[in-house]
Amino acid sequence: PEPPTACREKQYLINSQCCSLCQPGQKLVSDCTEFTETECLPCGESEFLDTWNRETHCHQHKYCDPNLGLRVQQKGTSETDTICTCEEGWHCTSEACESCVLHRSCSPGFGVKQIATGVSDTICEPCPVGFFSNVSSAFEKCHPWTSCETKDLVVQQAGTNKTDVVCGPQDRLRA
């Protein structure tokens, strides 16, 4: 056999020889020879490698720092990293979720279009005509104005995006 210039999938070329890569969850201890296969060892506690590899050191699991508002969403294994998320009321500042910020509240005149999650902030929308919000909230949607007519009442004061209509009794005097 001629010395290889390229190797099969899950192999790597070293010293004119194709050696097996270490499987996920294991690190390289020594390259193969023509007499022995690649020597691999499992990653230790709190370490992982998520691909077929020739790494001599495993990666440390991500630390979900509670001081940054983080908590563990999914514990890491020898083959996967720990996944962090944010404490209730907080959300990640990036896709990597390395820190958290408080969910935004929607000001009066705005309602919650989409409630925040551990990875996305609150989405607010202006209250359209016929709707209002009189509180600053991370949960409240815009509420529809009260329908005075259904209560046999009349509008005494028009509603705005921040206030409900004020209903009053109908004027009993008729011309």
């Epitope: 056999p1 001629e2 010395p3 020889q17 020879t33 023509e34 007499f35 022995t36 296969e37 020597e39």
Partner: antibody, heavy 117, light 107 residues
């Protein structure tokens, strides 16, 4: 036809030296890793040493490290084992073998080394 | 070094019998194991490589299995020429090491 023929065995005193040869034929010698395996009388097999093909890396069992040297001459299609500081426990039949895919697919008939005073 | 332990050390069987020889490694060697047959006064012969692959020219009555630390060599129907000594050999760690051998004798 692949053939491996060992020579150079014999009786030697403790502390003495011996050089074993293995003449190869029937295949492209330079393309294969080669090794020496020994078998003490009435005992099992023991891998002694190996030499790579292209890189020519050498490997030894702990029991012979520092005393034995494996080498090859691709122009002569010959494998060698230089054995120094021989001990009684080195007494064995020494086989040369061809390696392919981590297995020894062809073996010589063996040569007997006896270390005794 | 990795220790390879074969069992039994010797075994008596008859022609036509199904025979199993086991080999245990002192630590995991994945499927990096070979089996050899040796007859008295002869050089060993490679039977099985990579735990379960049959070497070219070896009869199909020979088979191998196992991975990690426990391996078996099975002869499905013993033939007269199968009476010999069998060795396992690991190549998962340097140096390669052999089991002590299992002598298969005629009952």
């Amino acid at each position: 036809e692949v053939q491996l023929l060992e020579s150079g065995g014999g009786l030697v005193q403790p502390g003495g030296s011996l050089r074993l040869s293995c003449a190869a034929s029937g295949f492209t010698f330079s393309s294969y890793a080669m090794s020496w395996v020994r078998q003490a009388p009435g005992k099992g097999l023991e891998w002694v040493s190996g030499i790579g093909s292209y890189g020519g890396g050498t490997y030894y069992a702990d029991s012979v490290k520092g005393r034995f040297t494996i080498s090859r001459d691709n122009s002569k299609n010959t494998l060698y084992l230089q054995m120094n500081s021989l001990r009684a426990e080195d007494t064995a039949v020494y086989y040369c073998a061809r390696y392919v895919n981590f297995g020894m697919d062809y073996w010589g008939q063996g040569t007997l080394v006896t270390v005794s005073s | 070094d990795i220790q390879m332990t074969q069992s039994p050390s010797s075994l008596s069987a008859s022609v036509g019998d199904r025979v199993t020889i086991t080999c245990r490694a002192s630590q995991s060697i994945s499927s990096y194991l070979n089996w050899y047959q040796q007859k008295p006064g002869k050089a060993p012969k490679l039977l099985i490589y990579a735990a379960s692959s049959l070497q070219s020219g070896v009869p199909s009555r020979f088979s191998g299995s196992g991975s990690g630390t426990d391996f078996t060599l099975t002869i499905s129907s013993l033939q007269p020429e199968d009476f010999a000594t069998y060795y396992c050999q690991q190549y998962g760690r340097n140096p390669p090491t052999f089991g002590q051998g299992t002598k298969l004798e005629i009952k």
